[in-house]
């Protein structure tokens, strides 16, 4: 049809922190590059109806639905969403195309549905249909990658059964220890599923999608190294594949490698060998031990032996269910105001945990580091010397673990005072929790040395703010002290702090704060 305009429908994803609701706009926000939604003519429909490709949006994401119309003359438009008309303000771009936009900020369930755009131009009328739905991330999964041998080839395939389809990459490193950290120059990444170069020192496969990134290291025994401080231990769940690589370098080819499980040679079909010459003409051999789906009886000591190297073993433990082993007893710490200190949790877990540190309802990222002895450790140092309760939470597919920490900061009390018609109260958050004294200031005692013991009520821990204890002391007003100045003092091993209050009328009248060290 010659009269039909050339139209283009696009989706623009925004990186904004706005919290307003959906609105029609002619000036969308700064955004990422637009995604073409196609906008094809819908067949067998009464009138001219264009249909854009379905749009899936994450909860709380912000998007713009945009239509570009290449038609002569002015256009007028109307958006309709759930039987409600929404204002529509077309404008023209530099190429003189009509531009109509619908901005949806902070996508919610209520903003999902069909958005109809009616456009009237000088030549014709037509409708554009957008279907917007919330992406169902409940169906999303990110599974740890595992290895398979490629059929008829000496190569490994990395598989991650995840939704949406993940990007798989091999992370390779040929040096030892610290220099194999993710962003080190020694690390090479290959975005492919199949790996042929299997002789490297450190081989990992990672899979990433919208849910994050998961990696699996190819478990390796290197016969040229001295043994690890702890016997290497590998945990697997029943049904998972087992892969262990044994690697050895020798001056010539005259050596062989073998795998044994509990002193019995592995059956044929459960291992394969590869060899190559390195740059200095030494021979590198690797021997893989593998079981495509482990059972309980695959548990035991796997020993790699060589005719020219000392043997080394790894303990493979097959479990029915994942686990997190750590002591969950709560721990209390007392530190000085400028003391360097980190909370730490040592744990053994399989599969690898996801974890968070929480303080005052705020979550902090959690890093974990593998130790030589098969344990992992997570440290939290970013407490900024704020006293209170800190929570470490870890979970994996099968287990959950929570540990509480209390941080107390040793400091001199700071006193706040308030008075009412019947009593005066003082509060302090110093640590260790302070003791209190009340003193009366009078002609007889201008230095406020006359101690008040009657009518004093101390509460050791009156308010617990995210684990931070506050101590208070209240003085009930009697005729004997009405109209006088009284002084409350809080003291602990780090010092004393006082506040003076006038007891003659309601309302707080503290007017002097003494800080006595």
């Amino acid at each position: 049809n010659q009269d039909l305009p050339v139209i283009k429908c696009v989706l623009i994803n925004h990186k904004n922190n706005d919290s307003s609701v959906g609105k029609s706009s002619s000036y969308p926000m700064v955004s990422e590059s637009p995604e073409d939604l196609g906008c094809a003519l819908r067949p067998q429909s009464s009138g001219t109806v264009y249909e854009a490709a379905a749009v899936e949006v994450d909860v709380s994401a912000s998007i713009t639905l945009q239509v570009l119309v290449d038609a002569p003359g002015n256009i007028s438009c109307l958006w309709v969403f759930k039987h409600s008309s929404l204002n529509c303000q077309p404008h023209f771009d530099l190429q003189n195309r009509g531009v109509v936009s619908m901005v949806i900020l902070k996508m919610t369930e209520t903003q999902a549905g069909e958005y109809l755009l009616f456009i009237q131009s000088e030549a014709t009328n037509y409708t554009i249909l957008f279907t917007v739905s919330i992406r169902n991330t409940l169906l999303y999964t990110l599974r740890r990658p595992y290895f398979r041998k490629m059929e008829n080839q000496d190569a490994l395939v990395c598989i991650s059964e995840s939704v949406p389809e993940p990007i798989v990459e091999w992370v390779l490193c040929d040096s030892q220890g610290e220099s194999c950290k993710e962003e080190s120059p020694a690390v090479v990444k290959k975005e492919e599923k199949v790996l042929h170069e299997l002789f490297g020192t450190d081989i990992r496969c990672c899979a990433r999608n919208e849910l994050g990134r998961e990696c699996t290291r190819l478990f390796t025994i290197d016969l040229n190294q001295t043994p690890q401080t702890t016997l290497p231990q590998l945990f697997l769940k029943v049904g998972e594949p087992l892969w262990i690589r044994c690697k050895a370098v020798h001056v010539n080819h005259g050596f062989g490698l073998t795998w044994e499980l509990e002193n019995k040679a592995l059956e044929e079909g459960n291992y394969f060998e590869m060899s190559t010459y390195s740059t200095n003409r030494t021979m590198i051999r690797i021997l893989f031990a593998f079981v495509s789906s482990v059972a309980r009886n695959d548990t035991g000591y796997y020993t790699c032996s060589s005719s020219k190297h000392p043997s080394q073993s790894a303990l493979v433990t097959i479990v029915e269910k994942g686990f997190i082993n750590a002591t969950n007893s709560s721990e209390d710490y007392e530190i000085d105001q400028y003391e360097e200190f980190c909370f730490s949790v040592r744990f053994k877990a399989y599969p690898q945990i996801r974890c968070t540190w929480t303080f005052s309802r705020k979550s902090f990222p959690c890093e974990q580091k593998g130790l030589d002895n098969g344990y992992s450790i997570s440290k939290f140092c970013n407490h900024k010397h704020q006293p209170g309760e800190y929570i470490f939470h870890a979970e994996n597919d099968d287990a959950q673990f929570t540990k509480m920490f209390t941080l107390n900061i040793r400091r001199k009390p700071q006193v706040l005072a308030e008075a009412s018609a019947s009593q005066a109260s003082c509060f302090s958050d110093g640590y260790p929790l302070p003791s209190w004294t009340w003193k009366k200031c009078s002609d007889k005692s201008p230095n406020c040395t006359e101690e008040i013991t009657e009518g004093v009520w101390n509460r050791k821990a009156n308010r617990k703010v995210f684990g931070q204890w506050v101590s208070s002391s209240t003085l009930n007003m009697s005729e004997a002290i009405k109209g006088f100045l009284v002084k409350c003092c809080a003291y602990n091993s780090l010092g004393t702090s006082c506040e003076t209050i006038l007891l003659n009328s309601p309302g707080p009248f503290p007017f002097i704060q003494d800080n006595i060290s």
């Epitope: 001295t226 043994p227 016997l231 043997s311």
Partner: antibody
């Protein structure tokens, strides 16, 4: 049969170094780690370190780090342990021991007495 | 490092007696434990490895048991040549560590 034969007794002054040898025979030298263990007079056994005769890589107890060096000569099937900056508390019998698997010491040398005295 | 504690530190017994020596690890070491016998002026000799496996050539009157943190060496019927010092050693981690020894003397 498997044998580990160590060098003879040594008397050294404080601050000096000593190098003890351990010659292996009766098995493929590069197929077993060799450990060094010492025993002070009337005391128990204390681990000093381990060497991989195939590659020459070694690992030492924290206590001896920086003072001990373990080397090997594959042509003579011999491992060496050198201890420097000697002090009187280093007086001990030093044993080399073959590692059967996972730090299991199935054969031991006869021991070398190192005496540190001024 | 893992601490190994042996008890008793010395023991008097007679030929034909059944003797038990215990060894405790400061943390779980699975079954990675060996027992050695040492006679004065001699190098130690491996008796038991992996907590309960008898080293070849060692008489069957020697036996070992235990796993985790608690281990036992048993001599079922003491012979004159068994009077010596016995050491346990963990091979779960490097550094391997030894117990302080148990001196077995003739009563």
């Amino acid at each position: 049969q498997v044998q580990l034969v160590q060098s003879g007794a040594e008397v050294k002054k404080p601050g000096a170094s000593v190098k003890v040898s351990c010659k292996a025979s009766g098995y493929t030298f590069t197929r077993h780690y060799v450990h060094w263990v010492r025993q002070a007079p009337g005391q128990g056994l204390e681990w000093v370190g381990i060497i991989n005769p195939s590659s020459g890589s070694a690992s030492y107890a924290q206590k001896f780090q920086g003072r001990v060096t373990m080397t090997r000569d594959t042509s003579t099937s011999t491992v060496y342990m050198e201890l420097s900056s000697l002090r009187s508390e280093d007086t001990a019998v030093y044993y080399c021991a073959r590692d059967r698997l996972r730090s299991r010491f199935d054969y031991w040398g006869q021991g070398t007495l190192v005496t540190v005295s001024s | 490092d893992i601490q190994m504690t042996q008890s008793p530190s010395s023991l008097s017994a007679s030929v034909g007696d059944r003797v038990t020596i215990t060894c405790r690890a400061s943390q779980s070491i699975s079954s990675s434990l060996a027992w050695y016998q040492q006679k004065p002026g001699k190098a130690p000799k491996l008796l038991i490895y992996a907590a309960s496996s008898l080293q070849s050539g060692v008489p069957s009157r020697f036996s070992g048991s235990g796993s985790g943190t608690d281990f036992t060496l048993t001599i079922s019927s003491l012979q004159p040549e068994d009077f010596a010092t016995y050491y346990c050693q963990q091979s779960y981690t490097i550094p391997p560590t030894f117990g302080q020894g148990t001196k077995l003397e003739i009563k």
